[in-house]
Amino acid sequence: SVGQYNCPGQYTFSMPSDSHVSSCSEDWVGYQRKCYFISTVKRSWTSAQNACSEHGATLAVIDSEKDMNFLKRYAGREEHWVGLKKEPGHPWKWSNGKEFNNWFNVTGSDKCVFLKNTEVSSMECEKNLYWICNKPYK
């Protein structure tokens, strides 16, 4: 298992096998050449994105099934914002500006995307959820 679930928003991390301890700062976890931060408090999607930006990161951009499964395991039963958003008439976009190529399905009918261990869905962006940031290894 990649991490243990303790209580909502609180996690005990065990380092994934490809982690390089020196590559990610304290409180960040390394996986697949990215550093991840998982919040212990809740914010709106925009506020969470701003929090990630303060650390030179974005809300999590998910590039592969491997990354997705990793994040779902870490998220556990709690809903966590990730960096995918839909604006009216526009294609889905990641928080780094890249267009989403629909490699997974988003359930729900709202603008901002969250994940937990069982699903990737959408919710009103103003709702306060935990969140996940990521950035490339330095």
Epitope: P88, G89, T107, S109, C125, E126
Partner: antibody, heavy 119, light 107 residues
Framework: QVQLVESGGGLVQPGGSLRLSCAAS????????MSWVRQAPGKGLEWVSV????????HYADSVKGRFTISRDNSKNTLYLQMNSLRAEDTAVYYC????????????WGQGTLVTVSS | DIVLTQSPATLSLSPGERATLSCRAS??????LAWYQQKPGQAPRLLIY???IRATGVPARFSGSGSGTDFTLTISSLEPEDFATYYC?????????FGQGTKVEIK
Amino acid sequence: QVQLVESGGGLVQPGGSLRLSCAASGFTFSNYYMSWVRQAPGKGLEWVSVISYDGISTHYADSVKGRFTISRDNSKNTLYLQMNSLRAEDTAVYYCARYIGNSLYMDFWGQGTLVTVSS
Amino acid sequence: DIVLTQSPATLSLSPGERATLSCRASQSVSSYLAWYQQKPGQAPRLLIYGTSIRATGVPARFSGSGSGTDFTLTISSLEPEDFATYYCQQEYSSPPTFGQGTKVEIK
């Protein structure tokens, strides 16, 4: 109450230009995404373009890309559609529509303005 | 682009009857689907969004269901003012697209 009033439609020759306006009232215009949707005579609805509340982000249907430009003036509570290089197939009633705040769906539409492209 | 196919093209019913309108998407649109009502010479009116959420002021006789590729608009008991054309619209994929419409006419 919410009101959207389109104007600027009329008869224009193929290759010509037209600028449509949509005057908004009864809500805080600058807080809403706005869109243009058209309907050819006796046909269904076709989404044309969208603009973000601040005017920075726009998106277009492939059928009008490079020919139409959506814009807005929040100080005048007005939405615009500049239509260039008009074709016969652009003949339609053009509606402006407001998106529900913080959502993805068009909850209020104007009554439309007819654009006829013909020689 | 995602193609929405509505059926039937025309539905002939009497006031008080139940109307069931179908909308099928060429690929999944999750629950990002809306229904609009349009009467001749008028602008479209939003009825349902997010597959099943009634817009403000829409009577309870209108309901929406479905997900993925198959969606239904149900009018439980037709009122005289419900005879109109109904369009489905998806907002999952860009560009947004509409179905070709279903006309509900008086039998």
